[in-house]
Interface confidence: low
């Protein structure tokens, strides 16, 4: 009897959908695996007789529930199927956006770049899939614990009237208000403001 794959899970970030599993202990030899997805009541092969312990399902439609399954095989024997269900638009993890930060005197000028969708055309981003896409920005004075959050209306934001010659750190994430779903925070970017540009009286 061939044991089934273990710890079967979907690792999906920005619609790069990788079904992953672990090979069970099997004394007779090396196992291979076949992974399939359900397409209108018929299971279609995606990865056949692979020695890998993952299979790329990024070409699935982003909408709707998908049934995926994987089994282990050895010679003419095979394990039972292990099934999981997966809805990309609901389940994919929203990766961190990109961010460009520029210091202009006592202001930080930020521009945000929605994460690109993996395995798609160059111009496609997560913003194109989710109509309610917005950004959360978190900033703080370097070395302090107090953080401030804002929700920019656009793909850019300016933090004005900051303390001069002070280092501020900023990070951004995608947020979907209609789903109450937040993405991963970007790595903090820390920049030092320069002088206050106000003209003395």
């Amino acid at each position: 009897m061939v044991p089934p794959p273990e710890n079967v899970r979907m690792n999906s970030v920005n619609f790069k959908n990788i079904l992953q599993w672990e090979s069970p202990a099997f004394a007779k030899g090396n196992l291979t695996f076949t992974a399939q997805y359900l397409s209108y009541r018929i299971f279609q092969d995606k990865c056949m007789n692979t020695t890998l312990t993952e299979c790329d399902f990024s070409s699935l439609s982003k909408y709707g529930d998908h049934t995926l399954r994987v089994r282990a095989e050895f010679a003419d024997e095979h394990s039972d199927w292990v099934n999981i269900t997966f809805c990309p638009v609901d389940d994919t993890i929203i990766g961190p956006p990109g961010m460009q930060v520029e210091v202009l005197a006592d202001s930080l000028h930020m521009r945000f770049l929605a994460p690109k969708i993996e395995n798609e055309y160059e111009t496609w981003t997560m913003k194109n899939v989710y109509n309610s896409w917005t950004y959360n920005v978190q900033y703080w004075k370097n070395g302090t614990d107090e953080k401030f959050q804002i929700t920019p209306q656009y793909d850019f934001e300016v933090l004005r009237n900051l303390e001069p010659w002070t280092t501020y750190c900023v990070q951004v994430r995608g947020f979907l208000p209609d789903r109450n779903k937040a993405g991963e925070w970007s790595e903090p970017v820390c920049e030092q403001t320069t002088h206050d540009e106000t003209v003395p009286s």
Epitope: S39, Y40, Q44, D45, K46, S59, L60, S61, K62, Y63, G64, H66, N119, E120, Y121, T123, W124, N128, V129
Partner: nanobody
Framework: QVQLQESGGGSVQVGGSLRLSCAAS????????MGWFRQAPGKEREGVAT???????RYADSVKGRFTISKDNAKNTLYLQMHSLKPEDTAMYYC???????????????????WGQGTQVTVSS
Amino acid sequence: QVQLQESGGGSVQVGGSLRLSCAASGYTYSNYCMGWFRQAPGKEREGVATIDGDGSTRYADSVKGRFTISKDNAKNTLYLQMHSLKPEDTAMYYCAADFALCDPTVVAHTDFGYWGQGTQVTVSS
């Protein structure tokens, strides 16, 4: 919201031709995967043809050499030119679109995000 509206269906004699159209609205990208599907009475819906954003096409074996899928990005319209029609081509034909690359491992999978209402094609002898 993406909307798809098919037209061009009708009745035709065996060996005849028809051209189906699918007008798409609600998005500006030409990079959608689009496809034609059909469903005959009492049968499963099946893929007929798909076309990718770059224009690459795939066909079901049953229509290869007879049907041609194409699109006009400027008009946001998808077409299916059907020649040498057979009685077994009789079905409701649906246009579908999805914000994804067409799946290269199957001719036309049916897990598309957006669907039209369909247009009837009847081939009689």
